[in-house]
């Protein structure tokens, strides 16, 4: 399996934005890479977002995705937004080298993202 | 050495308040117990606060202390307030059985407290 590295812990900002780098040890020069972010909480794993990109190009997530990202070599800079305290959990980076063959798969150990809901601002009367 | 248990991770609230329980495996019923909270960051250890209490009574920290606490049996419920993002670090609970003799000492593995500074509220014009 391909090695994937990601930070152990990240704190979301008070605006609910968390960013981390997912780095994969590519055995060669893939031209098409797929990155998926999975969330594990209470032994449940759900897909947060996914993007396929051509090396040297931007990552393109779906329009309604909470993720954005950029790539540089074997590193993917991922940003997840709109996070609330209830979204605290382990976010796992999964990388697939889609083309050219052979297919490679790597899964990181996960980044624990902690999210704290902000206090509401006082009403401006 | 006396065993001391404390949670691995705690998130401070958006108001900068963090609470955790420090539990010590007492060999019996000490009548006088001293609890100290130490902060370890960048291999520096500093004392955050300390209180000596008689079993069954409240913990009394100094008036200007950022800590408050209550005790119940072999558990101490600690609250640290006024925390900022720069205060993120490992907070270690140290428990000493002061009386009756013999003296017992226990030091926990530490609680990693994460603190996120809130976004400032917009000015109310």
């Amino acid at each position: 399996a391909m090695h994937v590295a990601q930070p152990a812990v990240v704190l979301a900002s008070s605006r609910g934005i968390a960013s981390f780098v997912c780095e994969y040890a590519s055995p060669g020069k893939a031209t098409e890479v797929r990155v998926t972010v999975l969330r594990q909480a209470d032994s449940q794993v759900t897909e947060v977002c996914a993007a396929t990109y051509m090396m040297g190009n931007e990552l393109t997530f779906l329009d309604d995705s909470i993720c954005t990202g950029t790539s540089s070599g074997n590193q993917v800079n991922l940003t997840i937004q709109g996070l609330r305290a209830m979204d605290t959990g382990l976010y796992i980076c999964k990388v697939e080298l889609m083309y050219p063959p052979p297919y490679y798969l790597g899964i990181g150990n996960g980044t624990q993202i902690y999210v704290i809901d902000p206090e509401p601002c006082p009403d401006s009367d | 050495a006396m065993h001391v248990a404390q949670p691995a991770v705690v998130l401070a609230s958006s108001r900068g308040i963090a609470s955790f329980v420090c539990e010590y495996a007492s060999p019996g019923k000490a009548t006088e117990v001293r609890v100290t909270v130490l902060r370890q960051a960048d291999s520096q250890v500093t004392e955050v606060c300390a209180a000596t209490y008689m079993m069954g009574n409240e913990l009394t920290f100094l008036d200007d202390s950022i800590c408050t606490g209550t005790s119940s049996g072999n558990q101490v419920n600690l609250t640290i307030q006024g925390l900022r993002a720069m205060d993120t670090g490992l907070y270690i609970c140290k428990v000493e059985l002061m009386y009756p003799p013999p003296y017992y000492l226990g030091i926990g593995n530490g609680t990693q407290i994460y603190v996120i500074d809130p976004e400032p509220c917009p000015d109310s014009d």
Partner: antibody
Framework: QVQLQESGPGLVKPSQTLSLTCAVS?????????WNWIRQFPGKGLEWMGY???????YYNPSLKNRVTMSVDTSKNQFSLKLSSVTAVDTAVYYC???????????WGQGTTVTVSS | DIVMTQSPDSLAVSLGERATINCKAS??????VAWYQQKPGQPPKPLIY???YRYSGVPDRFSGSGSGTDFTLTISSLQAEDVAVYFC?????????FGAGTKLELK
């Protein structure tokens, strides 16, 4: 490593006073802890009899009424038990043991068997 | 006095199987409960104190749980050397008291 060792007569006549001594090595009894006597009846049940503290304080099991007295000899690093007006029901293995105040017993002697019989 | 009621009186368990001994206090004793193991001709030996903490040198197959009035000693995988009598003990309130003991045998 603290060690406790009981000594005393193995046979006591009814109505007499049972006297036992516990010699402590590896720890000074005046430095701390509480020094207890516990007995185990032939049916294997354990009964805590009381303690004498490092400071000379004591507390006895109310079930023994006024029959029990404990004392300490710091110069010999030993403590003693006296149980008066014994009857056959006081036949038991007598252990000395150490604990923290109102604590569990972390060190025990090997025990000495006392039989009350005429 | 606080009465510690131990159950069962005796228990036969196969090697490698789990053994569970229960102790019920007649009133709340918090977490101030210890467990001892006694083999023939020997004094009781501390296994667990403060409900769930293993005494120094005690194998991790021994564990304790509970609080208040109900407590349990568990041996996760019985070994031949675990055959003994086990006692619970409350040290919350004087006079300190013990359970009557559970004799653990090999099946």
């Amino acid at each position: 490593q603290v060690q406790l060792q009981e000594s005393g007569p193995g046979l006591v006549k009814p109505s007499q006073t049972l006297s036992l001594t516990c010699a402590v090595s590896g720890y000074s009894i005046s430095s701390g802890y509480y020094w207890n006597w516990i007995r185990q009846f032939p049916g294997k049940g354990l009964e805590w009899m009381g303690y004498i503290g490092y400071d000379g304080s004591n507390y006895y099991n109310p079930s023994l009424k006024n029959r029990v007295t404990m004392s300490v000899d710091t110069s010999k690093n030993q403590f003693s038990l006296k149980l008066s007006s014994v009857t056959a029901v006081d036949t038991a293995v007598y252990y000395c043991a150490r604990n923290y105040y109102s604590g569990y017993f972390d060190s025990w002697g090997q025990g000495t068997t006392v039989t009350v019989s005429s | 006095d606080i009465v510690m009621t131990q159950s069962p009186d005796s228990l036969a368990v196969s090697l490698g199987e789990r053994a569970t001994i229960n102790c019920k206090a007649s009133q709340n004793v918090g977490t101030y409960v210890a467990w001892y193991q006694q083999k023939p001709g020997q004094p009781p030996k501390p296994l667990i104190y403060s409900t769930s903490y293993r005494y120094s040198g005690v194998p991790d197959r021994f564990s304790g749980s509970g609080s208040g009035t109900d407590f349990t000693l568990t041996i996760s995988s019985l070994q031949a050397e675990d055959v003994a009598v086990y006692f619970c003990h409350q040290y919350d309130t004087y006079p300190l008291t013990f359970g009557a003991g559970t004799k653990l045998e090999l099946k």
